[in-house]
Interface confidence: low
């Protein structure tokens, strides 16, 4: 009952299956690998998406930290363990009893240790900046007219609200889109700066996660805004625990 | 139970001002947006704006933008619409209404019983 | 702004009938349409939200369907209490804006 009801699919998440066997036949759609129930009025949480993709090949890469407790995705994708409203479970455990903590937004935060290891609550990530060029353009975007439209974005497509938007810094042909939502100014019903930079990675490198519409078309009055490359790095409310051997 | 309570009518005259107050109990107020819908009689509503309880961010229909001035007190959970200019126009019911921050929330749950403003002379 | 579009300002219906409410909007809203009911002298009352999610103690009688542009709103048997003003409202973006109504009436 959460889907497009004529052709019973789900508008923010294609990997679903949906059928109509909701209350009174009405549509209802659940996320393949978990079989949990989704909202397809809203976005899918990124645990329950990286569930969902696990067949996809393995995606590795290493980045530069902006501040010593940024934290960035080097571990690709794995199957996470996700809690009955789809957030990542603090625990993430693989197959050969090799455990470790996460973030909200399912980053490990610590060092890899076995079943012992304990992850007492799941931090919040509550600042990301996500880190652009674009290629290569006539001339530099106007600032605001970049800032306006990213904003936009944000808000249209992944329905984040503006203030949690906290930035767009422009240096052509680098673009830092800051997000920040801390664990009290997140109201029920609002959407996670972790699932909307997700969306946004996944829109950016044209596997978008929506179903049935097209793949981003950023322009800036009028002019195309085509991303060569994105790093995204990751702050938590509580500095991630790593030995000093990872940091040196 | 949750709840918006908002005075029964006020009479002004054209062109002064009248300050509008819709109490909220029941809630955590500074959890959801404060909107104010206007009616006039026979027909559709209409938004004027809403306010962040928070931080006092407000955003307006550009319609109301030059007359329309929202406010909070937060120890008193109380909201505040402040029209000025006042014409026949503006006599109508105004309701406050609750909304959800997330924009997927945007719709209205909880509502005044509204305020009818007479304009007359 | 979005207009929100509501084809029949009034329709008539009788008691135990399947009525439906259409509302079109000028642009695509996703899933982003609510659905309220107004009696007279009073405030409204939201029954659907997000095009086809029914509020907390809405009767099932009441639902919603739609995506992008095009909505419906449709009582499954028609009671008695039921005929009265119902309005649609976008809340895709700023500025929230509602259908002029449509009115329920006996046949």
């Known amino acids: 009952h959460t889907a497009a009801q004529d052709n019973c699919t789900c508008p923010t998440n294609k990997m679903t299956v949906c059928s109509p066997d909701g209350p009174g036949g009405r549509c209802q759609c659940r996320a393949l690998g978990s079989g949990m129930a989704v909202d397809c009025s809203t976005l899918t949480s990124k645990c329950l998406l990286l569930k969902a993709r696990m067949s996809a090949p393995k995606n590795a890469r290493t980045l530069v930290r902006p501040s010593e407790h940024a934290l960035v995705d080097n571990d690709g994708l794995y199957d996470p363990d996700c809690d009955p409203e789809g957030r990542f479970k603090a625990r993430q455990c693989n197959q050969t009893s090799v455990c470790w903590c996460v973030n909200s937004v399912g980053v490990r935060r610590t060092d890899k240790g076995d079943l012992s290891l304990r992850c007492d609550e799941l931090v919040r990530t509550h600042h990301i900046l996500i880190d652009l060029r674009h290629r290569p353009t006539a001339g530099a975007f106007n600032h605001s007219d970049l800032d306006a439209e990213l904003r936009r974005l944000f808000r249209e497509r992944y329905r984040l609200h503006p203030k949690f938007v906290a930035a767009v810094h422009y240096e052509q042909p680098t673009i830092q889109i800051e997000l920040r939502q801390n664990t009290s100014q997140k109201a029920a019903g609002d959407v996670d700066i972790g699932d909307a930079a997700y969306y946004f990675e996944r829109d950016i490198k044209g596997e978008s996660l929506f179903q049935g519409r097209g793949g981003l078309d950023l322009r800036v009055r009028g002019e195309p805004l085509q991303v060569e490359r994105t790093l995204i790095y990751y702050l938590d409310e509580i500095p991630p625990k790593f030995s000093m051997k990872r940091l040196t | 139970q949750v709840q918006l309570q908002q005075p029964g009518a006020e009479l002004v005259r054209p062109g002064a001002s009248v300050k509008l107050s819709c109490r909220a109990s029941?809630?955590?107020?500074?959890?959801?947006?404060m909107n104010w819908v206007k009616q006039r009689p026979e027909q559709g509503l209409e938004w004027i704006g809403r306010?962040?309880?928070?931080?006092?961010?407000?955003h307006y229909n550009q319609k109301f933008k030059d007359r329309a001035i929202l406010t909070v007190d937060k120890a008193s959970n109380t909201a505040y619409m402040q029209l000025s200019g006042l014409t026949s126009e503006d006599s109508a019911v105004h309701y406050c209404?609750?909304?959800?921050?997330?924009?997927?929330?945007?719709?209205?749950?909880?509502w005044g019983a509204g305020t009818t403003v007479t304009v007359s002379s | 702004d979005i207009v929100m579009t509501q084809s029949h300002k009034f329709m008539s219906t009788s008691v135990g009938d399947r009525v439906s409410i259409t509302c079109k909007a000028s642009q695509d809203v996703s899933t982003a349409v609510a659905w309220y009911q107004q009696k007279p002298g009073q405030s409204p009352k939201l029954l659907i939200y997000s095009a086809s999610y029914r509020y907390t103690g809405v009767p099932d009688r009441f639902a919603g369907s739609g995506y992008g542009t095009d909505f419906t709103f449709t009582i499954s048997s028609v009671q008695t209490e039921d005929l009265t003003v119902y309005h649609c409202q976008q809340h895709y973006s700023t500025p929230l804006t509602f259908g002029p109504g449509t009115r329920l009436e006996l046949k």
């Open positions: 209404a609750r909304s959800g921050f997330g924009s997927t929330y945007w719709f209205f749950d909880v």
């Open positions: 306010i962040d309880p928070n931080d006092s961010e407000t």
């Open positions: 029941g809630y955590t107020f500074t959890n959801y947006w």
